[in-house]
């Protein structure tokens, strides 16, 4: 059974992940059109289901494309380099989902824009945090 200290650690990691994803989203929302329009042609895959920490596997698999689009649409909107930002997220995701069980991610048929993708994972973090508090 999860201890209060492990629950607290999970909560803090999720809050950190949430802040990183929100920072990226805020940076993107600061782009002026038509640059934002161009970024929205970059496609992301969404999880069919995202209700448990193991489903973060689906986020992990899309981190490389996320780093790519942030590099390609390079901007001064981010304080950290995309590589460092995504590396930080990757470390948190790996810790949160754990490596004991191998989970095969199932993706939805519809793809998403970067904004929809980030919003989906922000909602996921918020939802899990709310169950822990």
């Amino acid at each position: 059974a999860p201890t209060s200290s492990s629950t607290k650690k999970t909560q803090l990691q999720l809050e950190h992940l949430l802040l990183d994803l929100q920072m990226i989203l805020n940076g993107i929302n600061n782009y002026k059109n038509p640059k934002l329009t161009r970024m929205l042609t970059f496609k992301f895959y969404m999880p069919k289901k995202a209700t448990e920490l193991k489903h973060l596997q689906c986020l992990e698999e899309e981190l490389k494309p996320l780093e790519e689009v942030l590099n390609l649409a390079q901007s001064k909107n981010f304080h950290l380099r995309p590589r460092d930002l995504i590396s930080n997220i990757n470390v948190i995701v790996l810790e949160l989902k754990g490596s004991e069980t191998t989970f095969m991610c199932e993706y939805a048929d519809e793809t998403a824009t970067i904004v929809e993708f980030l919003n989906r994972w922000i909602t996921f973090c918020q939802s899990i945090i709310s169950t822990l508090t």
């Epitope: 782009y31 640059k35 161009r38 042609t41 496609k43 895959y45 790519e68 689009v69």
Partner: antibody, heavy 121, light 113 residues
Amino acid sequence: EVQLVQSGAEVKKPGESLKISCKGSGYSFTSQWIGWVRQMPGKGLEWMGIIFPGDSDTRYSPSFQGQVTISADKSISTAYLQWSSLKASDTAMYYCARQGRSYHYYGMDVWGQGTTVTVSS
Amino acid sequence: DIVMTQTPLSLPVTPGEPASISCRSTQSLLDGDDGNTLLDWYLQKPGQSPQLLIYTLSYRASGVPDRFSGSGSGTDFTLKISRVEAEDVGVYYCMQRLEFPLTFGGGTKVEIK
């Protein structure tokens, strides 16, 4: 090896329909846009439009909108270009090319060998 | 649509000598205030499919020799070949991908003198 293999040459009469294909292999076909480019005899390259096979999102150049249909079958990693009623002016070489996860942020890095379409009565 | 204009139409070259092709766009190809320049160069060798040479203004595509280089800014761009080789003959095209629809230049035919 990453490649796009196109269907063979076609000779058609005006008014006939036609569907040519472009099969991808060696990469995740559903995660990259596939564009179509026309080259009329002795002329330059014209960008016709593009499809994302993962969700069949399709965009057409205004010059080709309503003239052709671009589609894809992700289960067999194949993109298509089709005409419902060919004209003599459709005579050209047609190329498919891969264009990454965003056609604004990637060049066309892999090309098919081209399909020659001849329309003559 | 963004119109891409290439000069010259034809370029006779001597092997071992440098060569230069120009491309001009009707508007800046810079992706935002601090972004990349969304311009590519392609080469179509006789009887072959086009191939990507240079992407995003100045990055050489995989396997492209370092004698090819791309430069420029805003609306004026240049493809340089430092020392032309016989295998470099063909038609060179610039292409913008800043705005939809993507558009190619008319092409520059490079041939050996």
